[in-house]
Amino acid sequence: AVLTQKQKKQHSVLHLVPINATSKDDSDVTEVMWQPALRRGRGLQAQGYGVRIQDAGVYLLYSQVLFQDVTFTMGQVVSREGQGRQETLFRCIRSMPSHPDRAYNSCYSAGVFHLHQGDILSVIIPRARAKLNLSPHGTFLGFVKL
Amino acid sequence: AVLTQKQKKQHSVLHLVPINATSKDDSDVTEVMWQPALRRGRGLQAQGYGVRIQDAGVYLLYSQVLFQDVTFTMGQVVSREGQGRQETLFRCIRSMPSHPDRAYNSCYSAGVFHLHQGDILSVIIPRARAKLNLSPHGTFLGFVKL
Amino acid sequence: AVLTQKQKKQHSVLHLVPINATSKDDSDVTEVMWQPALRRGRGLQAQGYGVRIQDAGVYLLYSQVLFQDVTFTMGQVVSREGQGRQETLFRCIRSMPSHPDRAYNSCYSAGVFHLHQGDILSVIIPRARAKLNLSPHGTFLGFVKL
């Protein structure tokens, strides 16, 4: 169809902020549960600890986590699970100071990836009971369909 | 021409991951050689240690390098070389802990720049023999034509 | 109207670099004054310490500040002020080493936000007399209209 000026600009976007973060007793990871703060388009669906891709395509993904933890290195892994396999897309790693008053770092990373319909995207911190700051301007996750 | 819904969305994109990293003996730098992991469009061409711009325009560029080095500050410089001159576009700098077990940091930066046809984009670490982690989800480089 | 190939690609963009940074005597903040380095479109206007949104919509915002400061944690807050209220959009936080020779870190963050006509966007470092490096490739601010 012929595009109007308005249609032309409508990249689907989703910016998510945390609801909470939990650790499973039997695994050395902390997962974040997300809720939408900004949404345009219908191709992405927040689903508990993940985001479901309903509209396949190339996306800019970004992730930030704010850590308050003296564990020597902290960081997050952004992965997609779909078609029976899991794939790490990108990760962020930050060395942390050993003094609790100084142990305060945000870790941001982003990249462009092809996501498939049905993929579930998740942010995992590979530490049990990681000390995170769940402020919406410190920890967030986002998608832009390109 | 009238744009179809599909044409409308086709930003050229290129996401690159490392092949290897090398240092020149006569210069205090480490350079990364890149290969495409995701490519859409023909305006960008990986060329050894650089990326050649074939389609001039405004691009979002992003770069991440994962450092495993106790040198007190590490980081990368993203530059363009073209029309007989070199220009630094942006850089990322990270102070590193002095203990090898803690010296693990990713450094991410990005920005929007006008690139000219024939420009060569490169990522340089201003340290010879810098200790990098060349995992494709830790060290990468990307372009989105806006 | 029917879009031409050229029209299709014209995201408004603005990439800004510092003019200077100042602290008000009566407040514990450092503010950066910005000037455009790259501009496409008319929807954004640099205005001293802020950027005025003239064209409402969804924007990718990014911010980097290069810190040279031994204060235990440094970082920047990106906020919008409009319609009588102020809102923090995102922030970046970096723990800093206590030794001046090592105290060198860039802090990058970004996200997608809906901005309203008349909003003023600003970058604030919540420290008086923060030691910043104002190199245009170390400290910058950018917008892409999506």
Epitope: - | S23, D25, D26, S27, D28, T71, F72, T73, M74, G75, T88, I93, P126, R127, A128, R129 | V17, P18, Q68, D101, Y104, K131, L132, N133, L134, S135, P136, G138, T139
Partner: antibody, heavy 121, light 107 residues
Framework: QVQLVQSGAEVKKPGASVKVSCKAS????????MHWVRQAPGQGLEWMGY????????KYNEKFKGKATMTSDTSASTAYMELSSLRSDDTAVYYC??????????????WGQGTTVTVSS | DIVMTQSPSTLSASVGDRVTITCKAS??????VAWYQQKPGKAPKLLIS???NRDSGVPSRFSGSGSGTEFTLTISSLQPDDFATYFC?????????FGQGTKLEIK
């Protein structure tokens, strides 16, 4: 306290080579780069490049590539600069100066006393 | 290469005067500018780094300002020991470059 002590004055014939040394003390030698700066008689200052003792890697001003060779000996906390194929216009005072290890964005905070190199037939 | 243009090249002043030396960069160098003082037969001495940060031990009468392309060194009240040559330097981009110098002499 930080000190940079350079070798003494040299008089050389055109075509010869000369090696200037700069011995550092009072700090961790491998944590800082050593810059070399030239000052011709009655002229300004010209940055020639640096040697990074951490990895013994040099960074040259393009103008001095092929003319200057910068090295370091960490066991002796000493930086060296060798000038080859000397010409009369290489007559100058050569200074070493300390800079922080991430060479960009740091000024040169301590300087050697300078070594005068005179090239004359 | 970035050109650093200093002015004036020579400045005559008296003890107690306030003097200003300016330096213009041919492109934006942020605040990555240093000022050095050099006396005849001696090595340069760092006065100011990051455009405005006085080095340790430098008297408070010396101050620096500016960012981007325009920088100034100000001596608020000249002392006899201040008559020397002053150089600006940018360290934002390789190769590092210096201004041509300003000779401050007694009037």
């Amino acid at each position: 306290q930080v000190q940079l002590v350079q070798s003494g004055a040299e008089v050389k014939k055109p075509g010869a080579s000369v090696k200037v040394s700069c011995k550092a003390s009072g700090y961790t030698f491998t944590s800082y780069v050593m810059h070399w700066v030239r000052q011709a008689p009655g002229q300004g200052l010209e940055w020639m490049g640096y040697i990074n003792p951490y990895n013994d890697a040099p960074k040259y001003n393009e103008k001095f590539k092929g003319k200057a060779t910068m090295t370091s000996d960490t066991s002796a906390s000493t930086a060296y600069m060798e000038l080859s194929s000397l010409r009369s216009d290489d007559t100058a005072v050569y200074y070493c100066a300390r800079g922080l290890g991430y060479a960009l964005y740091y000024a040169m905070d301590y300087w050697g006393q300078g070594t005068t190199v005179t090239v004359s037939s | 290469d970035i050109v650093m243009t200093q002015s004036p090249s020579t400045l005559s002043a008296s003890v107690g005067d306030r003097v200003t030396i300016t330096c213009k960069a041919s492109q934006n160098v942020g605040n990555n500018v240093a000022w050095y003082q050099q006396k005849p037969g001696k090595a340069p001495k760092l006065l100011i780094s990051s455009a405005s940060n006085r080095d340790s031990g430098v008297p408070s009468r010396f101050s620096g300002s500016g960012s981007g392309t325009e920088f100034t060194l100000t001596i608020s009240s000249l002392q006899p020991d201040d008559f020397a040559t002053y150089f600006c330097q940018q360290y934002n981009i390789y190769p590092f470059t210096f201004g041509q110098g300003t000779k401050l002499e007694i009037k």
